[in-house]
């Protein structure tokens, strides 16, 4: 029976609730009132219904038999729940149309609703309350009000905001003022005077955040109210003038030929004026730019001084100006609360230059073009040019230099690298270009001392060709010995040149000799399939690095074709 009664009660409670909510004028969430309060400080929040939404006050509503009900929705929850007014020490209470927190806690953050109702009338509004934390220097995510002070304007004051109604006039609170993190005492031109902070003469250096901490007693407890505002020192109205148009002016004439681009900047200086809207605009022949059948674009940029004086620039541009456009009147207008000004730009058609300048320009243009072409040709074909010069005018390096080999090949002893060296490199350099290669594993005699033989071979070679790959840089390998010997030889005696061929990319290496070599020497990169063609860039770069040699070499197109196909099969 009891269970049945509970179910029936709940059912009717639900009906009543839905019926009431349907009849209630819901003003929604009043996001204009983004209330932020500090954690662990008192907060008093008036129900916004009487301030913005209804045409009567709380006293009138109360005397008419209307009741004010409060409830809230916690942050990230959808459930509306009553406010607990039975917390210890009366932490949350309601007094007339004010909701009190003495003090707030972080989890008080949420949307609060106040509802005014009786049996026939209902009106409600919600507002967000955010409880925020502050650090020891009063820094917090709270949005700070900005107070503007006029520069060098005499005594000006700021007042500790939003502290009314927290304590009766009989209570004398203590007020401490801070600039940033520092307590204001013995400041030159800033003097705390209770709830006010006086600036004897405001200067740019006074820009910053100012905090007042109000401490007051209540029922044997001590509460603190912290209020921070930003002070911005701005231009004084004493110095304010109507807008000043710097350009266009009488000294600059915009002289253009038909077909050229016409650019006229309008640069205007505006003194700072509280709540003044600064505007700059153009007229053409006294009309709006859109009313003229020409393709006009106007771009605006704005900059501010430290005292918030403003410079606006509007650039009027006509891509291809006509002789008619050059006869028009272009006027820049500027307006602020101090007045409106206008200035016309001096625009005129350029007198055509004498005829010979065209020929001169053409000649100069042709010369420049020729130089550019030569530079491009050199840039693209420099390898071919060097090789052509060497083939016809270069002196043979190999005569009487006492060397046995043209190239000593140093590489990582690894199947892939060996295949590249023995088939690809040897195939082209020996068979195509007629160079004599020394490959240790092929040319050394068994049973010899590796170190001695390596050094001997390197001394007998005109070039040391290093095939770089990740395997190459492994410590203690034969390849590293070859590299060190070659670099030593090159540095001390200068009778061998080192050529670096990057077979595969080498990431950051700890081998200092290789690091140094890579910074000093040009690295010729093998690009796989792209590099196989013997007439390609890779082989030409390699040829340039090789010793000049007047030896008969097979280079008929047939054989090149053959060797390319044989390379493709590698």
């Amino acid at each position: 029976m009891t269970l049945l009664w509970c179910v029936v009660s709940l059912y009717f409670y639900g009906i009543l609730q839905s019926d009431a909510s349907e009849r209630c004028d819901d003003w929604g969430l009043d996001t204009m009132r983004q209330i932020q309060v500090f954690e662990d400080e008192p907060a008093r929040i008036k129900c916004p219904l009487f301030e913005h939404f209804l045409k009567f006050n709380y006293s009138t509503a109360h005397s008419a038999g209307l009741t004010l009900i409060w409830y809230w929705t916690r942050q990230d929850r959808d459930l509306e729940e009553p406010i607990n007014f039975r917390l210890p020490e009366n932490r949350i209470s309601k007094e007339k149309d004010v909701l009190w927190f003495r003090p707030t806690l972080l989890n008080d953050t949420g949307n609060y609703t106040c509802m005014l109702r009786n049996t026939t009338y209902c009106s409600k509004v919600a507002f967000p309350l955010e409880v925020v934390q502050k650090d020891s220097c009063f820094n917090s995510p709270m949005k700070l009000p900005v107070h503007k002070l006029y520069i060098e304007y005499g005594i000006q004051r700021i007042t500790c905001p939003n502290v009314d109604g927290y304590f009766p006039s009989s209570v004398k609170p203590t007020i401490t003022w801070y600039m940033g993190c520092y307590k204001i005492q013995n400041f030159n031109n800033v003097i705390p005077e209770g709830m006010n902070l006086s600036f004897l003469i405001a200067l740019i250096s006074n820009n910053g955040n100012y905090t007042c901490v109000v401490t007051y007693p209540e029922n044997g407890r001590t509460f603190h109210l912290t209020r921070t505002l930003t002070v911005k020192v701005v231009g004084s109205p004493k110095n304010a003038v109507p807008p000043v148009i710097h350009s266009p002016n009488d000294h600059v004439v915009y002289e253009k030929e038909p077909g050229e681009e016409l650019l006229i900047p309008c640069t205007v200086y505006f003194s700072f004026l509280m709540d003044s809207r600064n505007e700059v605009w153009w007229t053409i022949d006294g009309k709006k730019p859109d009313d003229i059948t020409i393709d006009v674009t106007i771009n605006e940029s704005i900059s501010h001084s430290r005292t918030e004086d403003e410079t606006r620039t509007q650039i009027l541009s006509i891509k291809k100006v006509t002789s008619e456009d050059l006869k028009r009147s272009y006027v820049c207008h500027a307006r602020s609360a101090k007045g409106e000004v206008a200035k016309a730009a001096k625009v005129k058609q350029k007198v055509p230059a004498p005829r010979y300048t065209v020929e001169l320009a053409c000649g100069f243009g042709a010369t420049v073009l020729l130089v550019v072409i030569l530079i491009v040709v050199y840039h693209v074909y420099w390898l071919e040019m060097v090789l052509f010069y060497r083939a016809h005018f270069g002196t043979d390096e190999t005569i009487l230099d006492g060397k046995e080999y043209d190239i000593y090949v140093s590489y990582a002893r690894n199947a892939e690298e060996e295949e590249f060296v023995l088939l690809t490199l040897r195939g082209v350099l020996e068979n195509e270009f007629g160079y004599k290669l020394c490959i240790f594993d092929r040319d050394s005699l068994p049973g010899g001392i590796v170190t001695d033989e390596t050094l001997s071979f390197i001394q007998k070679s005109r070039r040391l060709l290093v095939v770089l790959s990740p395997n190459y840089v492994l410590q203690g390998t034969q390849a590293l010995l070859e590299l060190k010997a070659g670099l030593e030889n090159m540095a001390s005696r200068g009778n061998i040149n080192v050529i670096l061929v990057q077979y595969k990319a080498v990431k950051e290496t700890k081998v200092k000799e290789l690091k140094r070599a890579k910074t000093v020497l040009t690295v010729i990169k093998w690009k796989g399939e792209k590099s196989k063609y013997p007439q390609g860039r890779f082989w030409k770069q390699l040829q340039v690095a090789m010793p000049v040699k007047k030896s008969p070499r097979r280079s008929s197109s047939d054989e090149q074709g053959l060797s390319y196909s044989s390379l493709k099969n590698v």
Partner: antibody, heavy 118, light 113 residues
Framework: QVQLFQSGAEVKKPGASVKVSCKAS????????VHWVRQAPGQGLEWMGW????????DYAQKFQGRVTMTWDTSISTAYMELSRLRSDDTAVYYC???????????WGQGTTVTVSS | DIVMTQSPDSLAVSLGERATINCKSS????????????LAWYQQKPGQPPKFLIY???TRESGVPDRFSGSGSGTDFTLTISSLQAEDVAVYYC?????????FGPGTKVDIK
């Protein structure tokens, strides 16, 4: 040709918000102010405010301060006017109009009827 | 705010006759720096948005017939329709755009007698 096209009629309950759009075509959207003017049934014209789509600056009539928000979207050449906390006396035809700075409102939208009724 | 008043509230004029509408501002809308009064006139027909007629007191908007003319300076302004046509039946509003909030006059209804 130059046109301002407004969104369709709206019926709202007291306390709700309404957002009216105004799409511009045939001119450089950022080169002109967009004004919002309303006209209650059988009444005169009432200026609500303006927005400069070039700078984003706004100026609202004191009467609507705190209730009106004017925004814009340059990419689609559209201005918006949102009026919150609607009351029955907000029932009116809402017009958008453009002006080249101080040249008066030369082009008007067709109007959007907003009815506020419980 | 600048308050705009218009007189008369309504007037009936025979076709082809002159119609004159007066507009008064509570303070001057004249910018001395360019000697321009920032006053506009609009025409509104039933069920239509207002139509821009005149700006800067006397400058006709392109496409507006020359029978419409504006005059005045400072605080007193006049819109004149030199020869009323049937299509001119409408409500006429003056508006100041000297300073925000821009304000309109209450309107003058023009009918045919």
């Amino acid at each position: 040709q130059v046109q301002l096209f407004q969104s369709g009629a709206e019926v709202k309950k007291p306390g709700a918000s309404v957002k009216v759009s105004c799409k511009a075509s045939g001119y450089t959207f950022t080169g002109y102010y967009v004004h919002w003017v309303r006209q209650a049934p059988g009444q005169g014209l009432e200026w609500m405010g303006w927005i400069n789509p070039n700078s984003g600056g706004t100026d609202y009539a004191q009467k609507f301060q705190g209730r009106v928000t004017m925004t814009w979207d340059t990419s689609i050449s559209t201005a918006y006017m949102e009026l919150s906390r609607l009351r029955s006396d907000d029932t009116a035809v809402y017009y958008c109009a453009r002006s080249y700075y101080y040249y008066g409102m030369d082009v008007w939208g067709q109007g959007t009827t907003v009815t506020v009724s419980s | 705010d600048i308050v705009m008043t218009q007189s008369p509230d309504s007037l009936a004029v025979s076709l082809g006759e002159r119609a004159t509408i007066n507009c008064k501002s509570s303070q001057s809308v004249l910018y001395s720096s360019n000697n321009t009064s920032y006053l506009a006139w609009y025409q509104q027909k039933p069920g239509q948005p207002p139509k821009f007629l005149i700006y800067w007191t006397s400058t006709r908007e392109s496409g507006v017939p020359d029978r419409f003319s504006g005059s005045g300076s400072g605080t007193d302004f006049t819109l004149t329709i030199s020869s009323l046509q049937a299509e001119d039946v409408a409500v006429y509003y003056c508006q100041q755009y000297y300073i925000t909030p821009f304000t309109f006059g209450p309107g003058t209804k023009v009918d045919i007698k």
